[in-house]
Interface confidence: low
Amino acid sequence: QSPTPSPTDAYLNASETTTLSPSGSAVISTTTIATTPSKPTCDEKYANITVDYLYNKETKLFTAKLNVNENVECGNNTCTNNEVHNLTECKNASVSISHNSCTAPDKTLILDVPPGVEKFQLHDCTQVEKADTTICLKWKNIETFTCDTQNITYRFQCGNMIFDNKEIKLENLEPEHEYKCDSEILYNNHKFTNASKIIKTDFGSPGEPQIIFCRSEAAHQGVITWNPPQRSFHNFTLCYIKETEKDCLNLDKNLIKYDLQNLKPYTKYVLSLHAYIIAKVQRNGSAAMCHFTTKSAPPSQVWNMTVSMTSDNSMHVKCRPPRDRNGPHERYHLEVEAGNTLVRNESHKNCDFRVKDLQYSTDYTFKAYFHNGDYPGEPFILHHSTSYNSK
């Protein structure tokens, strides 16, 4: 008994009668009754067949894999298990496809064989400076081939984003994130090679440290304390600027406080603190800024002091300003002593004193010093005598 056809089988029931033709040869005439829908033609059935090309790096030949659900037959027995073997790159091959589920005509499939896989290389073209937030991937042709390059298309899929370009650039990415990009190259819309890359974006710039306070503790000292940024970093750079001079220090990542020494008194210091990370390149975080003015200190000594006689009983005392004022104000003081007695005590804006009405023929000690409003400086001391009156 013949098996019962399934509803999906294209099954034909036929009854046959035999007669003789005038030539005497037997003619079989067949009456066919379709009991289920007729089979499609193989040309129709496989109209939209797709092909994947698999490359053998040893033989440098391709295998075309036919994407069909059943085991098809190919004319001249050119295929096995839905695969057509030993295809040369950039050459056309014609294959006739048939199966017992479809009728003639066969599907004639033109296999347009792609270029060799090793002639393409997926290259990471990300600029190191931008590697924290961008990814660049590019297919490079590293050898020549005879296929028509117009027929080559490139496809990338990174997450849910799809690009049909030879080169892709993903921007505004999160630092320190892994991104997976799958890419394939198609020749006449048939995939022939693919590659996947998992790329981890580089460490991003660290955030800005949070300065808790910065202040001057003394004339030659200052202190700065901070909270570190939340993102990864390697170390800190602390710069301090006075007028046009700039000094920078590299500080250990575990520090949250730094004492500045050997500062100049009564000077404004501008401090900038940033974290940095050594990744593919060094990335500096935003700098946090603060400033302070160091406390006052005694000024240095006035210099180039001169005492000259302007008349028998008058003297002219001059001096040059101190090299370091170290305070807010500017005042010059002159003390004149005879013996151990203070006979004059004058204060001027400039170091230019005219001392009159001194005793004749007397030894005087002249002490000039600078006062900065907070501290007096070391006095410059000169001795000078008045002469006998000339009259």
Partner: antibody, heavy 117, light 112 residues
């Protein structure tokens, strides 16, 4: 202060889609990620995913990746979540929440979605 | 995925007493930066969740000092001292150390 104002309740048929909004105010919209959380009636909280409004980067919980589409409009400081192919399992309250450095610090009042034929 | 487990409270808590709510994680929430990414929320009836504690033990802004968080990498406790009627609701712990972020099933607090 910071506010996340979510759109009103939705009643939808099975198989349909709904799109809800979360209007942010009182802070710089592009400086924080917007998280989305699901809460079924009488149940706990489930994280759906987030969008970074600045870059458009989206991370989904795999469980919701075929259900949910997250978008954000910087100009209107509004985040959106679309639910597609609705089933009764999607009936829930959906919250948007701003993520600070280590926590979800501000939450919307929730949008109730009811799927019923 | 990281699984977060919370226990039920067996009985309502008397106002003025203290209560501990526990939370367990299937994986350590201690991250390489030394921080433990475990947060606690309170969801009062009919309201959105409200952040109480973050990074295991840091109280969120404006949260009463009656709430304190502690724990190790996998076992955590939320302590509420001098419980008040306004503390009723469901308490959730949440991990933020690994995608997908996950919440505990919640612990309901009732006050008598």
């Amino acid at each position: 202060g910071v506010q996340l104002q979510e759109s009103g309740a939705e009643l939808a048929r099975p198989g349909a889609s709904v799109k809800m909004s979360c209007k942010a105010s009182g802070y710089t919209f592009t400086s924080y990620t917007m998280q989305w959380v699901k809460q079924r009636p009488g149940q706990g909280l489930e994280w759906i995913g987030y969008i970074n409004p600045s870059s458009g980067y989206i991370k989904y919980n795999q469980k919701f990746k075929d259900k949910v589409t997250l978008t954000a409009d910087k100009s209107s400081t509004t985040a959106y979540m679309q639910l597609s192919r609705l089933t009764s399992e999607d009936s829930a309250v959906y919250y948007c929440a701003r993520r600070g450095s280590y926590f979800f610090d501000f939450w919307g009042q929730g949008t109730s979605v009811t799927v019923s034929s | 995925d990281i699984v977060i487990t919370q226990d039920e409270l067996s009985n309502p808590v008397t106002s003025g007493e203290s209560v501990s709510i526990s939370c367990r994680s299937s994986k350590s929430l201690l991250y390489k930066d030394g921080k433990t990414y475990l947060n606690w929320f309170l969801q009062r009836p009919g309201q959105s969740p409200q952040l109480l504690i973050y990074l295991m033990s840091t109280r969120a802004s404006g949260v009463s000092d009656r709430f304190s968080g502690s724990g190790s990498g996998t076992d955590f406790t939320l302590e509420i001292s001098r419980v008040k009627a306004e503390d009723v609701g469901v308490y959730y712990c949440q991990q933020l150390v690994e995608y997908p972020f996950t919440f505990g099933g919640g612990t309901k607090l009732e006050v008598k």
